[in-house]
Interface confidence: low
Amino acid sequence: GGGGSKHKCVQNSLVNNETLESIMNTLESEEDFRKYFYYLEGSK
């Protein structure tokens, strides 16, 4: 997605924002994060 829609999804997410730091091992990839944001946006 484009920057605007991605930002919108982040703002409406229930989880982390995009500055999630890596504590030992980050649990998900950046792609997974984006998919998850869209999932939450679509489920509202």
Epitope: S13, N17, Y38
Partner: antibody, heavy 118, light 112 residues
Framework: QVQLVESGGGVVQPGRSLRLSCAAS????????MHWVRQAPGKGLEWVAV????????HFADSVKGRFTISRDNSKNTLNLQMNSLRAEDRAVYYC???????????WGQGTMVTVSS | DIVMTQTPLSSPVTLGQPASISCRSS???????????LSWLQQRPGQPPRLLIY???NRFSGVPDRFSGSGAGTDFTLKISRVEAEDVGIYFC?????????FGPGTKVDIK
């Protein structure tokens, strides 16, 4: 190191209120969704509530909806659970937990005990 | 709500021997993003829960490789290849695919 420390538990009468807190350290608190999970003595785990990293989105278990509120202060690295109209069945150890992507609960606090008794 | 069940509820094991715990969900845990958000947690006596496995089979950092997870859809398994004394405790499966998030009842693992 990454740490979550709960406080505020104690003995309270039915119908009264209690406020739990969770102090976070060792990670960028404002980047993570945060959860409360409880465990009645000798029983299993029950998810209670989640709040988004920015505090704008919240979701509750039906058993506490309308009675409990979740909030956070990112400037103080603190998570709160305001518990009103407490019932005997709310007696439990309350844990705060960090939520990674997919709501995976990757880091847990030691818990604080709430006893509801007349 | 998604109901999580576990079998067995109690598992006495011999040190050095394998152990297996099954977890079943009342509906598929595959989310629309293609991921399956099934985690395994360990709770040692007197301790808080600790994340072992996330997304079915991914070991969390610091978790020994004797722990492994498998499964798909509604049926999942946690295996301990060789049980050690420190593995004694209660093991919970948890789904974070759908609100409200739910846990299995727990499986108590102890030494024979």
């Amino acid at each position: 190191q990454v740490q979550l420390v709960e406080s505020g538990g104690g003995v309270v009468q039915p119908g009264r209120s209690l406020r739990l807190s969770c102090a976070a350290s060792g990670f960028t608190f404002s980047s993570y969704g945060m959860h409360w999970v409880r465990q009645a003595p000798g029983k299993g785990l029950e998810w209670v509530a989640v709040i988004s990293y920015d505090g704008n989105n919240k979701h509750f278990a039906d058993s506490v909806k309308g009675r409990f509120t979740i909030s956070r202060d990112n400037s103080k690295n603190t998570l709160n659970l305001q518990m009103n109209s407490l019932r005997a069945e709310d007696r439990a150890v309350y844990y705060c937990a960090r939520g990674a992507s997919g709501f995976v609960l990757d880091i847990w606090g030691q818990g604080t005990m709430v006893t509801v008794s007349s | 709500d998604i109901v999580m069940t576990q079998t067995p509820l109690s598992s006495p094991v011999t040190l050095g021997q394998p152990a297996s715990i099954s977890c079943r969900s009342s509906q598929s845990l595959v989310r629309s993003d293609g991921n399956t958000y099934l985690s395994w947690l360990q709770q040692r006596p007197g301790q808080p829960p600790r994340l072992l496995i996330y997304k079915i089979s991914n070991r969390f950092s610091g978790v020994p490789d004797r722990f492994s997870g498998s499964g798909a859809g509604t049926d999942f398994t946690l295996k301990i290849s060789r049980v050690e004394a420190e593995d004694v405790g209660i093991y919970f499966c948890m789904q974070t695919t759908q609100f409200p998030f739910t846990f299995g009842p727990g499986t108590k693992v102890d030494i024979k």
